[in-house]
């Protein structure tokens, strides 16, 4: 706590300007009116205050707005935003995308901090859903943002927002997240023609079911191995050798290099060796000729 001391004669701040950087901690506390600070917050960012001085300025705003800062102040916080705790931010009601952008700009180049995560959470909850403009903004600042959301949170993303998603935005998504995003992407891109559709949907295919992969195999898409390796194992297993060959096109040769890794390894174990041999890649581990394959999962379902 800063002691309450009287402001020395002639030192009372008439405006927020660079002369204040020469004020000692107690002088700032005594000589800067909190209401003046609030109305001239836009100037603070242009003045090279020390961290100690920023602590004093924050303390003044906290006293003026114990229930949380108004958006007019929040929008101009600048570097002072880095001083806020998640608890401070939970008191805010941020509705303007411009305010969000201004604060994200301050944190640009740094990893997503707890403060930023709280700010985004408050903003998205206030809007009710993750609309396209918001998603555009967030992924521009944090390409991994989408993959930081839980499947439940992702369920509030409207299909129209999927157009804002770039392939790199999905790099760190796990299968559970892609399971939620894929149907939205399928809906968003449904009116595109074959090749264009595949280009757009490709990054989301880690959430695709078997029937969609079968359908893609009929469209000469030439899926690359990197995409194939990210597919759900349970979606790949029922595909026939012929379907995988059609799905991968010229990239089918890459299966050999990946034969020990999922989902290729598990898929090989489900195929007849005869069928695998037709690929001419030397893939081993298939079901030997003459063996009968029982689908136990089907039997369990019947019993």
């Amino acid at each position: 706590e800063v002691e309450k001391t009287a402001c020395p004669s002639g030192k009372k701040a008439r405006e927020i300007d660079e002369s204040l950087i020469f004020y000692k901690k107690w002088e700032l506390e005594a000589c800067v009116d909190a209401a003046l600070l609030a109305t001239q917050m836009d100037r603070v960012n242009a003045i090279p205050f020390t961290y100690e001085q920023l602590d004093v300025l924050k303390h003044k705003l906290d006293e003026l707005y114990p229930q949380g800062y108004p958006e007019s102040v929040i929008q101009h916080l600048g570097y002072l935003f880095l001083k806020m705790s998640p608890e401070d931010i939970r008191k805010w009601n941020v509705t303007s995308l411009e305010t969000l952008k201004a604060l994200l700009e301050v944190n640009k180049g740094h990893e997503m901090s707890p403060q930023v995560a709280t700010l985004i959470d408050r903003f998205v909850k206030g809007r009710g859903q993750l609309d396209k403009d918001t998603l555009d903004t967030l992924t521009a600042f944090y390409p991994g943002y989408l993959c930081s959301l839980s499947p439940e949170e992702l369920s509030s993303v409207p299909p129209s927002s999927i157009w804002a998603v770039r392939p790199q935005d999905l790099d760190t998504c796990d299968p559970r997240q892609l399971d939620v995003l894929y149907p939205k992407a399928r809906l968003a891109f449904q009116n595109m023609n074959g090749s264009e559709y595949f280009v757009k949907i490709q990054s989301f295919l880690g959430g695709a079911p078997t029937e969609d992969l079968k359908a893609l195999s009929q469209q000469n898409v030439s899926m690359d191995l990197a995409t194939f390796m990210k597919l759900r194992t349970d979606a790949v297993l029922p595909l026939t050798v012929a379907e995988v060959q059609k799905l991968l096109g010229p990239h089918v040769e890459g299966l050999k290099a990946e034969e020990r890794h999922r989902p290729v390894r598990d898929w090989i174990l489900r195929q007849r060796q005869d069928d695998l041999d037709t690929l001419g890649l030397g893939l081993q581990g298939g079901i030997p000729n003459g063996y009968l394959v029982l689908d136990l999962s089907m039997q369990e379902a019947l019993s």
């Epitope: 950087i21 901690k25 242009a46 090279p48 020390t50 961290y51």
Partner: antibody
């Protein structure tokens, strides 16, 4: 690429004013504050002062009156107003690590320029 | 008057070993402390800022910790190239903008 380079260091007699110049490239002095740090032979680092993007100067308490920092669009000068033998040191120019701050860490340093004060 | 005190100096350890350098501030500076490495004839090189954040391109063998008045720099898996003098610097307030006295690290 971004760089800073000091020049002007030489042998001077006590009381003869000397101005050192720091020339920057690859970034703008309107975006970053710049500081001067010195190091006497075999001794540690000593912060002298810093100049803000807006041209405001701030000095270590021991350096007030002994040094003057000023700048142009691409250079930052350090004037040693009346050198004494205690001012013999390598003088480094360094960029403050983030725009918007006057007091911060330094993330870009010059190689330094040697000033020798002797009669 | 604000002071940053570094201990010990010099400190020595064998290749592959670990050294810990301490920096003590005479006032609370929160986490606003940086660490630098300086080799003879070269300018200082930023290693760590805000007490624990590794600067770009710096090996993860360097680890900073602490807040308030007590800070440490730990160098693990020592290499010959780590032989240098290490400085801490505070930048919380105008009155506490200063460097520590330096700690020489000798690698045997």
């Amino acid at each position: 690429s971004q760089s800073v380079e000091e020049s002007g260091g030489r042998l001077v007699t006590p009381g003869t004013p000397l101005t050192l110049t720091c020339t920057v490239s690859g970034f703008s002095l309107s975006s970053y504050a710049m500081g001067w740090v010195r190091q006497a032979p075999g001794e540690g680092l000593e912060w002298i002062g810093t100049i803000s993007t807006g041209g405001i100067t701030y000095y270590a308490s021991w350096a007030k009156g002994r040094f003057t920092i000023s700048k142009t669009s691409t250079t930052v000068d350090l004037k040693i107003t009346s050198p004494t033998t205690e001012d013999t040191a390598t003088y480094f120019c360094a960029r403050v690590g983030s725009s918007g701050y006057l007091f911060y860490f330094f993330n870009l340093w010059g190689q330094g320029t040697l000033v020798t004060v002797s009669s | 008057v604000f002071e940053l005190t570094q201990t010990p100096s010099p400190v020595s350890a064998a290749v592959g070993g670990t050294v810990t350098i301490r920096c003590q501030a005479s006032q609370n500076i929160k986490s606003y402390l940086a660490w630098y490495q300086q080799k003879p004839g070269q300018p200082p090189k930023l290693l760590i800022y805000e007490a624990s954040i590794l600067a770009s391109g710096v090996s993860s063998r360097f680890k900073g910790s602490g807040s308030g008045t007590e800070f440490t720099l730990t160098i693990s898996d020592l290499e010959c190239a780590d032989a240098a003098t290490y400085y801490c610097q505070s930048y919380y307030a105008a009155s506490s903008n200063a460097f520590g006295g330096g700690t020489e690290v000798v690698v045997k």
